[in-house]
């Protein structure tokens, strides 16, 4: 898989929060490509050397996944072709909080965006009338 490295594509993320013990979503979108096989998604976390998640050639590639995320991540594979690189994080842990990078490579070029992910015990406020 080769790209010049000189072209950049637009990648957009949204800061979000996850409830400990529940599933969370790290949102990321990008300029879509025509061919799914030309899209690479890499999720990284600040200070962690292994990957959070990698998706390439139309499927997950988890050989370089960091141990702390093993078995807990997934992308929405059927939505990658339309530019959705969001990550589903299962069983959110307190230690999942931090800065993440969504890194995208397509035939058009590459791009990335960071997002802050907060974790905690959040609850919906009750409204009494």
């Amino acid at each position: 898989f080769g790209i010049s490295g000189r072209h950049s594509i637009t990648v957009t993320t949204v800061a979000s929060a996850g409830n400990i013990g529940e599933d969370g979503i790290l949102s990321c979108t990008f300029e879509p490509d025509i061919k799914l096989s030309d899209i690479v998604i890499q999720w990284l976390k600040e200070g962690v050397l292994g990957l959070v998640h990698e998706f390439k050639e139309g499927k997950d590639e988890l050989s370089e996944q960091d141990e702390m995320f093993r078995g807990r991540t997934a992308v929405f594979a059927d939505q990658v072709i339309v530019g959705n690189a969001s990550l589903r994080l299962k069983n959110v842990q307190l230690t999942d909080a931090g800065t993440y990078k969504c890194y995208i490579i397509t035939s058009k070029g590459k791009g990335n965006a960071n997002l802050e992910y907060k974790t905690g015990a959040f609850s919906m406020p009750e409204v009494n009338v």
Partner: antibody
């Protein structure tokens, strides 16, 4: 000024132990992954070990796995390498190095001056 | 483990020459590649990261290119202070691995 200063090297017999330290200053220590890299006399660079910014994840070269332990004390801004069951082939200059940026995909931008470990009887 | 093969292992060049060093990874590392310069008795110095990004303070005569498995470090006009050993290093996969080094000597 961003600085790394190693200490703890010396002469040790085969089978012995040493603990290397790397004192960091001038940057936020707990946001950077840190590495140990070594260089045997007249040889090239060999990556030894690394630790995540939080200290929660550690990584080792196969040649040192089970013998070396990397750790960090964020309160002291110090990185450590505990080396046990030392062998002659562990003889090298040991460098600590900081990961550039906050993620794993870049190189090592700040290096210490190195500390020499000699394993010999 | 990913193997990094650097070539040549040594070269002789003159001041003002254009010098090219290549590095090949045993499998794709995208652009997760750095280049270092090391002088005798000194710690390595980061020159290039992300395959082609020049580290702050490094002269613009140094440039990097490539992605996937094949990478190049180019010194456009060799200066006296550039005589040193150069290493490539991949950071896509642990264990991180270095190339064997290229010693640039004075012709």
């Amino acid at each position: 000024e961003v600085q790394l200063l190693e200490s703890g090297g010396g002469l040790v017999q085969p089978g012995g132990s040493l603990r290397l330290s790397c004192a960091a200053s001038g940057f936020t220590f707990n946001t950077h992954a840190m590495h140990w890299v070594r260089q045997a006399p007249g040889k090239g660079l060999e990556w030894v070990s690394a630790i995540s910014g939080s200290g929660g994840s550690t990584y080792y070269a196969d040649s040192v796995k089970g013998r070396f332990t990397i750790s960090r004390d964020i309160s002291k801004n110090t990185l450590y390498l505990q080396m046990n069951s030392l062998r002659a082939e562990d003889t090298a200059v040991y460098y600590c190095a900081r990961l550039l940026g906050r993620f794993g995909e870049y190189g090592m931008d700040v290096w210490g001056q190195g500390t020499t470990v000699t394993v010999s009887s | 483990d990913i193997q990094m093969t650097q070539s040549p292992s040594s070269l002789s060049a003159s001041v003002g020459d254009r010098v090219t060093i290549t590095c090949r990874a045993s499998r794709s590392i995208y652009t997760w590649l750095a280049w270092y310069q090391q002088k005798p008795g000194k710690a390595p110095k980061l020159l290039i990261y992300d395959a082609s990004t020049l580290q702050s303070g490094v002269p613009s005569r140094f440039s990097g290119s490539g992605s996937g498995t094949d990478f190049t470090l180019t010194i456009s006009s060799l200066q006296p202070e550039d005589f040193a050993t150069y290493y490539c290093q991949q950071s896509y996969s642990t264990p991180y691995t270095f190339g064997g080094g290229t010693k640039v000597e004075i012709k």
